[in-house]
């Protein structure tokens, strides 16, 4: 067809950005594009086209009207993780095409099973305290806190330190004494982990 | 349409090597791993291992080791199943299965039949 | 490795009928445990992942249920299109349970 005045290339005027969602949550990677005649958009995650319900009426990937990119749930398996990575959208028309800036989308998740689970400590009162957890493997990495007998860990106590996986209790009083839990916490939720007994015995 | 298209049935000798192919169509090929299933005649379905196609890493329970190898053509979107030594119960329906980002086999290839007969 | 230990081996049943088939892992696998059906000279069909979801297509008479070791596949009224052979699998180390061949009584 010819060459008419008014017609133009594509031009990206809203670049996806990236995000980090939950497992099973909904998603949109926009896109925006201007040119003349109005452009079709694709997608593309390493190089590959990205498939859409415009290919598969049972994809859990929509391309929307506006050209965003819109998944119905992030889907993650153990080892097939097909909507992670990063994407493109890329513009075109019968003048050329335009390529948005890279958008890398990451799945966040929180593993079921604790590495380390604490366990049963003894101590004499006045004598230091520790116990240790490694959180289930997540991304973002779990933050770790520690509950007592099912409340929140007082750790503006001085006595009290958690760093990293340890909680550690410089000297024991017969109170500290009862049924501890170590809670990894990231964007998907919380895990505890087994109970883990502290006695502390009398002099 | 999603689907994983198998090479034809094989007749191989004892000791000799046999390959089967898997083209994956329809989707991201390099998004989801390909693992690979036997049933031997009248038997339950036994997994030996799977690739990703994206870097080409394999895994393969200990029974295979050593005799399969798995590989993959990204340009032409194929799985590749190797079985080496083969012995007479090595005969076998071998299925091409794409594993889901829910842990599950969604997709399977209609089947290899591979017999080993002397 | 896990051991999956699917039981009954086989059952004789008949149109309409309420049908349990039960999946025993060795260890814990969480809800790692997918069912599958298979008809005579075709490929697996996956029925159940991740313990309970019903993959898309599939005729809401199936369920799953269980977590931990402990698994059942049900389907509340048996069709004629139903008998088959049933696997569970686990996905952690993704061996599958011997199979469960449901026929007419």
């Known amino acids: 067809s010819r060459l008419r005045q008014e017609d133009f290339p594509p031009r990206i005027v809203e670049h996806p950005s990236d995000l980090i969602v939950s497992k099973g949550e909904p998603a949109t990677l926009n896109c925006k594009a201007e040119g003349r005649p109005t452009p079709t958009i694709e997608w593309y995650k390493g190089g590959e086209r990205v498939e859409t319900d415009k290919d598969d009426p049972r994809s859990h990937r929509m391309l929307l009207p506006s050209g965003s990119l819109f998944f119905l749930r992030i889907v993650h398996g153990r080892r097939s993780k097909p909507d992670e990575g990063v994407y493109v959208c890329v513009a075109r028309n019968y003048l050329g095409e335009a390529v948005s800036h890279n958008a890398s989308l990451e799945v966040a998740i929180l593993r079921d099973d604790f590495r380390q689970n604490p366990s049963d400590v003894m101590v004499a009162v006045g004598e230091p305290a520790v116990m240790e957890c490694q959180p289930p493997r997540g991304h973002p990495e779990p933050t770790i806190s520690w509950k007592k007998d099912g409340s929140p860990l007082d750790d503006k106590d001085e006595r009290i330190t958690i760093r990293g996986g340890k909680l550690m209790i410089t000297y024991t009083r017969k109170s500290d004494a009862g049924k501890y839990v170590c809670v990894g916490t990231n964007m998907v939720g919380e895990r505890e982990s087994e109970v883990a007994e502290l006695t502390v015995l009398e002099r | 349409e999603v689907q994983l298209v198998q090479s034809g049935a094989e007749v191989k000798k004892p000791g000799a090597s046999v390959k089967v192919s898997c083209k994956a169509s329809?989707?991201?090929?390099?998004?989801?791993?390909m693992h690979w299933v036997r049933q031997a005649p009248g038997q339950g379905l036994e997994w030996m291992g799977w690739?990703?196609?994206?870097?080409?890493?394999?895994e393969f329970p200990q029974k295979f080791q050593g005799r399969v190898t798995m590989t993959r053509d990204t340009s032409i979107t194929t799985a590749y199943m190797d079985l080496s030594r083969l012995r007479s119960d090595d005969t076998a329906v071998y299925y091409c299965?794409?594993?889901?980002?829910?842990?599950?086999?969604?997709?399977w290839g209609q089947g290899t039949m591979v017999t080993v007969s002397s | 490795d896990i051991v999956m230990t699917q039981s009954p081996s086989s059952l004789s049943a008949s149109v309409g009928d309420r049908v349990t088939i039960t999946c025993r892992a060795s260890?814990?696998?969480?809800?790692?445990l997918n069912w599958y059906q298979q008809k005579p000279g075709k490929a697996p069909k996956l029925l159940i992942y991740?313990?309970?979801s019903l993959q898309s297509g599939v005729p809401s008479r199936f369920s799953g249920s269980g977590s931990g070791t402990d698994f059942t596949l049900t389907i509340s009224s048996l069709q004629p299109e139903d008998f088959a052979t049933y696997y569970c699998?686990?996905?952690?180390?993704?061996?599958f349970g011997g199979g469960t061949k449901v026929e007419i009584k």
């Open positions: 299965a794409r594993e889901s980002g829910d842990d599950a086999f969604d997709i």
């Open positions: 329809g989707y991201t090929f390099t998004g989801y791993y």
């Open positions: 690739i990703n196609p994206k870097d080409g890493d394999t």
């Open positions: 260890q814990s696998i969480s809800s790692y």
């Open positions: 991740a313990a309970s």
């Open positions: 699998q686990q996905s952690v180390g993704l061996s």
